[in-house]
């Protein structure tokens, strides 16, 4: 009997990209007359269904309608590919394909890992009290949540407060704050993506006299 094989490692996609999932029968077997079901998590959550020699779009979950195409150019050899367009973070998770003849079925399961690389961090000054400078570093559009860090002149980690929230698309916005003294030197804020091993960084130089003292004079007529 044939077996079904799917992607042998997690499929990677960035938000906004298209993804392709492939399933094939081994040994090669014509699957034109079989049911091919791509599903999400559980068998009944249909991403795309091919049955009776044609696609069955009315069986799809609403969030996949208009976003999938079953590539059947090699279905006679038992090879089927599903394209999923315009990936969002909500698409991340386990997927499977189940191929069934009248008397037999097999399935394969794999993971879709979705990532989004956020913006270059923006460092701003939020306060200046008793020669202490309050810094804020903001970056948006990440998935999953990045590791956010302040680093000192020698690259040492600096303790920090961080806040995270999610936007309407499920992406993470991160901000971290830090209080430093006027002569702190070179301070950097970095955001690191866990899966992609990518890091974005911004740097600011805090000099000895960051703000010059100003003498105020009252102008009188």
């Amino acid at each position: 009997q044939w077996q079904v094989f799917g992607p042998d490692k997690p499929v990677q996609a960035l938000v906004g990209e298209d993804a392709a999932f492939s399933c094939f029968l081994s040994p090669k077997t014509n699957a034109e007359a079989m049911e091919v079901r791509f599903f999400r998590g559980q068998f009944s959550s249909v991403v795309h269904l091919y049955r009776d020699g044609k696609d069955q779009p009315f069986m799809q979950m609403p969030q996949y309608q208009g976003r999938t195409k079953l590539v059947k150019d090699s279905i006679a050899e038992g090879r089927i590919s599903l394209r999923l367009e315009n990936i969002t973070v909500l698409d991340a998770g386990l997927y499977g394909c189940r191929i069934s003849s009248q008397s037999y079925y097999q399935k394969a399961i794999w993971e879709l890992q979705v990532s989004a690389l956020g913006s270059v961090p923006l460092i701003s000054i939020t306060g200046y009290v008793d020669r202490d400078i309050q810094l804020l570093c903001q970056s948006s559009g990440w998935f999953p949540r990045p590791t956010a860090k302040w680093k000192g002149p020698q690259g040492q980690d600096l303790s920090t407060d961080s806040r995270t929230n999610r936007d309407m698309h499920g992406l993470f916005d991160v901000e971290i704050s830090l209080t430093v003294q006027e002569n702190a030197g070179s301070i950097s804020c970095s955001m690191r993506h866990a899966h992609l091993s990518r890091e974005v960084e911004s740097r600011v130089q805090i000099g000895d006299t960051f703000f010059e003292p100003i003498s105020w004079h009252l102008a009188t007529k």
Epitope: L14, A20, K69, S74, R83
Partner: antibody, heavy 123, light 106 residues
């Protein structure tokens, strides 16, 4: 065997329109996406757009949005590219290509190309 | 749209020499394709999904990369490898191609 047979060379006047054809054999075009790519003389490849012949949905590169129309006829297994308001800078070889399913690495790619149609726009 | 920049634009290599062509994307993509074209002929798929060789491509070719940086490498240059190579991203619309690298034999 998969083949893409394109229509013959065209010599047209500025301002005219033409319709190029790409007839597939060895597979059904509705099972794939069909793309059009152009190559101006001594230049690189430029993606024009693609169609999903199963439903007629098409995407275009922004610069070709008002220049190109892509259609498909699944009964004749043929994809078409219509170009309007032709100018000398549209002189190029136009290729059709199939984006087929490739089964290693979980991706797909433009795996078969037509022989190209040469379009010359000249007065 | 995702702009792809190839380097070098033109290069020549001696038979047996190792050759590397790079493709830099202005923003990250998950996969890259490479296409070979010889003068007067249609383009051919050469490498897909970053590192998979298309049917009939000699195993002296390899592809690698991730994110914004991708490359095509020939371990030992041969005369038949002289051609123009284009990188192409299939991750987003509009699909885009690099400007091409013309590889000549010395």
């Amino acid at each position: 065997e998969v083949q893409l047979q394109q229509s013959g060379a065209e010599l047209v006047r500025p301002g005219a329109s033409i319709k190029l054809s790409c007839t597939a054999s060895g597979f059904n075009i509705e099972d794939d996406y069909m793309h059009w790519v152009r190559q101006r003389p001594v230049q690189g490849l430029e993606w024009i757009g693609r169609i999903d012949p199963a439903n007629g949905n098409a995407n275009f590169a922004p610069k070709f949005q008002d220049k190109a129309t892509i259609t498909a006829d699944t009964s004749s297994n043929t994809a078409y590219l219509q170009l309007s308001s032709l100018a000398s800078e549209d002189t190029a070889v136009y290729y059709c290509t199939r984006e087929g399913g490739l089964y290693y690495g979980n991706s797909d790619a433009m795996d078969y190309w037509g022989q190209g149609t040469s379009v010359t726009v000249s007065s | 749209q995702i702009v792809l920049t190839q380097s070098p634009a033109i290069m020549s290599a001696s038979p047996g020499e190792k050759v590397t062509i790079t493709c830099s994307a202005r923003s990250s993509v998950s996969y890259m394709q490479w296409i070979q074209q010889k003068p007067g002929t249609s383009p051919k798929l050469w490498i897909y999904s970053t590192s998979n060789l298309a049917s009939g491509v000699p195993d002296r070719f390899s592809g690698s990369g991730s994110g914004t940086s991708y490359s095509l490498t020939i371990s030992r240059m041969e005369a038949e490898d002289a051609a123009t190579y284009y990188c192409q991203q299939r991750s987003r619309y509009p699909r885009t191609f690099g400007g091409g690298t013309k590889l000549e034999i010395k």
